[in-house]
């Protein structure tokens, strides 16, 4: 007879159970969000259930499907784009992913008005960008680097653009630097209010040094990839914006946008592009030391059909204690009298914040003010501004929706979302429909993610889009980790920090630490949002504590604590991560022994570099896919905050913060190095160069590689890698398995 | 009032090189892309080669590609044909055109290019 | 590239007559960069009919530009006596941009 202890059947903490790992790479407990496809004030399309394109429209409650699920499922079609006239869609199929927002695809066009599929002059594959005119049904597409434009989606195409290579020069989408750090889109082609004018962006990249790796695939030979990706200190892309008149292209051809003359005499960037109207444009450029910026307003001149850059329409926005802006230099939201805009930068106190530009910048007339940050506008109507910020309660983590009337003086401020759902919706994010008639909040948490639909005049809700009610269902059985956001204060620095404790946390027993670091410059790791994610199951079913700390560098908290890293990235994040896990230690729950950290990217370098500074605070580690010296990443991103890798700039620093020179420091901590060997972004030489030195030094250590995989780690490899990185985790802590 | 003068024509052998001009007034020359067309004595009308308002691209038909070259230089107003290695068929009036592709509005009076030994 | 044959070669016609000149490409152009000259004898080619149909500036509206696709037609309502001439119709959706071989309009 066996013994069993029997079950308390009336405690409900025993019917339920912890997350599990699988429960975890399943994506069991993940959330739906819901953005209205908007396509006039109060209309918006939206993908069903069962695939049905369905048009919704808020003021008479209809809702009629434009698109069947059999005419997407006749050509494999994931996605979809109706033209503004509503006469035709483009159906995507074939996708086939390249970089992080690139990608190629094969496109049809379907005739509302008739049924069927448009034949006569088809579309090419695969095409790399396509999208329709804001007006009418004009299309504009990249085809092998090269623009063309169909008047009609049955004409023949117009190629505006000849000089498109491969991997040398780029027409109307981005090369791998420009979309990685700079646009952060797959497209560098923008057509003007009415469909007018189409402005492109070439990118040659004929002098950039090329990295080349080895993709092994399955044939008898690996294959190898190139790509062109200016390293820090290299040869960058030149750039040069054209603009051509659509209505009649072939007569004036591609006009050339004028670079502004003091960005033009050294290196430099363009960074995005804004039209006002079909006859002003808005460019903005940045030095290639990036802490001055320009914006531009140009004018077409009909009578010379040129287009005019006047230096009095040139705004210079210039950082004394960084770099330009935050993580991109923020782009302008214009007003309706076309000239005047509203931008984010920093006030006197160093604090980013709304400004209204009438003339020059130099006049600027703040909006918003306070020891918090102004983080995104998102419409500008007649007499509303909406945007987010993270002031409410002081939470620099959070993000609330505020309207400030620009119609009325003074303006008034009111915050829409701070007392909607105020225990379960702290992070929002909106959409607007036109003139901002309608809008869509989506809250991500802290609790279950919601989305609702609002009137734009009242505020109102109208109705709920998605409230993950079967997410709600699913959690009520699981042992789900307590969190907390708190603040830790040392020597004048505010170190906010997110810790995450198992279900049955009691403050008398020791557990075992994991740091989860990010730390990149600009980023926010501390932030009211839901997850179910690994580090949850951690704690939920190991026992763990996980704490994630935003240190110096990071963004939303000032410039004070964002510049700090400036020129010297590596030393105040490692500094910060170490003096919050001293703080966690006193806190008293802490095992010391049994402390680790890990990070990917950028919070693999910190991580590696945490653990090899000698503290002896860290058992163990894992850095998965880590810089290991800045000058093996991309130019755009560590130049804005390392400056250049030369003798009489700041080479000194590039050589002492890699993780190569603190190979010796490795010795006494357990460390699992992880990299993809197809990473285009983080390159696997990085890794490869930390194997080496740690060789070189004759220190053990553990290493994983995922063959032909980008700096993602997607597909089975994820299963993998979190199965693996658990087992390091569990014999580093001594957890039976 | 839109002017295009060319010149620089003339009789040339074969194999020889000859420099054709085309100064430009009445319009911002800068912003337009320009053309040059040909017509052979008693033929058709050939175009040539095109170039962007700021020079930045430049586009020849294959029948020329690799012995002209066709550039202008925006602060002389001048639009300019680099002729190279050239050959009987090569011999027509040249006419500059305003224009890139089509819809060339205004053109040259030209000037004769006769490729003889 | 595109051809574009011009019919009929030549077009004898009297002044105060209405004239069709056709012109037929070998694929799909559309009006939006179709284009019909004027020349005559020693002088350099004139634009009529710019891209999209529309008329040339200063360009009298007894001539008009119509068609689509491949088919291309230019009409001139009441042939005046300038109006004797080698007329070219011209494409520019596609490289090369190519001109017609020209219909001759001559004097009955």
């Known amino acids: 007879i066996v013994l069993r202890p029997s079950r308390v059947h009336n405690s409900e903490e025993n019917t339920m159970r912890a997350l599990t790992l699988k429960d975890i790479l399943n994506g069991t407990f993940s959330y739906k969000t819901f953005f209205p496809n908007w396509i006039s004030g109060q209309e918006y399309l939206h993908q069903s259930a069962d695939n049905n394109i369905v048009l919704y429209n808020i003021e008479t409650g209809q809702s009629y499907t434009i698109l069947s699920n059999r005419t997407m499922k006749s050509v494999n079609a994931s996605n979809y784009g109706l033209s503004p006239d509503r006469q035709f869609v483009y159906l995507e199929s074939d996708y086939s992913k390249l970089w992080r927002y690139s990608y190629t695809a094969t496109y049809y066009i379907y005739d509302l008005s008739n049924g069927e599929f448009v034949r006569g002059n088809e579309l090419p594959r695969p095409i790399q960008y396509l999208c329709w005119s804001p007006v009418g049904s004009k299309l504009a597409y990249v085809y092998q680097n090269n623009i063309y434009l169909k008047q009609r989606p049955g004409d023949p195409p117009f190629q505006i653009t000849f000089n498109g290579r491969e991997n040398k020069i780029f027409n109307g989408i981005p090369d791998w630097v420009y979309e990685e750090e700079m646009l952060a889109t797959k497209y560098a082609l923008w057509w003007s209010p009415n469909g007018k004018f189409l402005a492109y962006a070439e990118f040659n990249d004929t002098d950039i040094p090329v990295i080349a790796y080895s993709y092994y695939g399955d044939e008898q030979y690996p294959r190898t990839i190139n790509i062109p990706y200016p390293k820090a200190g290299a040869k960058n892309p030149v750039v040069r914006i054209f603009i051509i008149d659509t209505t009649y292209p072939a007569y004036v051809g591609p006009q050339e946008v004028p670079v502004p003359a003091m960005i033009a005499s050294s290196d430099y960037y363009f960074s995005w592009l804004t039209w006002v109207t079909d006859e002003r444009v808005c460019l903005q450029w940045l030095k290639r030391v990036q802490n001055v910026s320009v914006l531009s307003i140009c004018d077409f001149r009909e009578d010379w059909q040129t287009w005019d850059c006047p230096k009095t329409q040139e705004h210079i926005e210039e950082s004394r204690t960084g770099w330009a802006g935050g993580f991109f230099v923020s782009t302008p939201v214009f007003s309706y009298d076309a000239i005047s805009y509203y931008k984010i930068f920093s006030d006197k106190d160093g604090y980013k914040h709304i400004h209204y530009i009438k003339d020059t910048v130099e006049n600027a007339i703040q909006i918003t003010s306070g020891k918090w940050e102004a983080i995104n506008i998102f419409r500008v109507t007649q007499d509303s501004l909406f945007y987010s910020s993270n002031e409410f309660e002081e939470y620099p983590g959070r993000r609330n929706i505020y309207r400030i009337s620009i119609g009325s003086y003074p303006p008034s401020k009111k915050c829409v979302t701070c007392h909607l759902r105020k225990e379960r919706c702290q992070y929002y994010t909106a959409s607007f429909s036109d003139y901002a008639k309608y809008y869509a909040l989506v809250c991500y948490g802290p609790g279950i993610p919601i989305s609702t639909l609002h009137d734009g005049r009242t505020d109102q809700e109208i109705k709920i889009l998605e409230e993950n009610k079967e997410l709600e269902n699913a959690l009520k059985n699981i042992q789900l980790p307590k969190e907390e956001i708190k603040k830790l204060e040392v020597d004048e620095i505010t170190l906010w920090y997110k810790m995450i404790l198992p279900p049955q946390f009691d403050r008398s027993k020791k557990y075992p630490l994991l740091i989860q670091v990010y730390g990149g410059p600009c980023s926010q790791s501390v932030r009211s949002v839901f997850a179910v994610n690994w580090i949850s199951y951690l704690a939920s079913k190991e026992g763990m504590v996980i704490a994630l700390v935003d240190g110096r560098g990071t963004a939303f908290q000032g410039d004070k604590l964002l510049y700090a890293v400036y020129r010297k990235l590596g030393v105040y994040e490692v500094e910060d991560q170490i003096t919050a896990v001293r703080k966690f230690i006193e806190m008293g729950f802490i095992d010391e022994k049994r402390i680790a950290i890990w990070g990917w990217s950028y919070g693999g370098y910190v991580s590696s570099l945490a653990l090899a500074s000698g503290t002896g605070l860290f058992k163990c580690g894992i850095a998965v896919a880590p810089v290991s010296s800045w000058e093996y990443y991309a130019s755009v991103y560590t130049e804005r905050f390392m400056g250049l890798p030369t003798k009489d700039d700041n080479l000194e620093h590039y050589k002492n913060s890699t993780v190569m020179a603190r190979a010796e420091y490795f010795r006494n901590v357990d460390y699992l190095l992880i990299h993809g060997t197809a990473d285009d972004n983080v390159h696997f030489q990085n890794s490869a160069q930390i194997a080496k030195a740690l060789v070189n030094a004759q220190v053990d250590f553990q290493a994983m590689w995922y063959s032909d995989q980008n700096h993602g780690l997607s597909g089975l490899s994820t299963n993998h890698l979190y199965t693996h990185m658990t087992h390091f985790l569990k014999q580093c802590f001594s957890l039976s398995d | 009032e839109v002017q295009l003068l060319e010149s620089g024509g003339g009789l040339v052998q074969p194999g020889g090189s000859l420099r054709l001009s085309c100064a430009a007034s009445?319009?911002?020359?800068?912003?337009?892309?320009m053309s040059w067309v040909r017509q052979a004595p008693g033929k058709g009308l050939e175009w040539v080669s095109a170039?962007?308002?700021?020079?930045?691209?430049?586009y020849y038909a294959d029948s020329v590609k690799g012995r002209f070259t066709i550039s202008r230089d925006n602060s002389k107003n001048t639009l300019y044909l680099q002729m190279n290695s050239l050959r009987a068929e090569d011999t027509a009036v040249y006419y500059c055109?305003?224009?890139?592709?089509?819809?060339?509005?205004?053109w040259g009076q030209g000037t004769l290019v006769t490729v003889s030994s | 590239e595109i051809v574009l044959t011009q019919s009929p070669g030549t077009l004898s016609l009297s002044p105060g007559e209405r004239a069709t000149l056709s012109c037929r490409a070998s694929q799909s152009v559309t009006s939006s960069y179709l284009a019909w000259y004027q020349q005559k004898p020693g002088q350099a080619p004139r634009l009529l009919i710019n891209?999209?149909?529309r008329r040339a500036t200063g360009i009298p509206d007894r001539f008009s530009g119509s068609g689509s696709g491949t088919d291309f037609t230019l009409t001139i309502s009441r042939l005046e006596p300038e109006d004797f001439a080698v007329y070219y119709c011209q494409q520019g959706i596609m490289l090369p941009p190519t001109f017609g071989q020209g219909t001759k309009v001559e004097i009955k």
């Open positions: 055109a305003k224009g890139w592709f089509g819809g060339f509005n205004y």
């Open positions: 170039i962007i308002g700021s020079g930045a691209s430049t």
């Open positions: 009445g319009f911002t020359f800068s912003s337009y892309a």
């Open positions: 891209v999209g149909s």
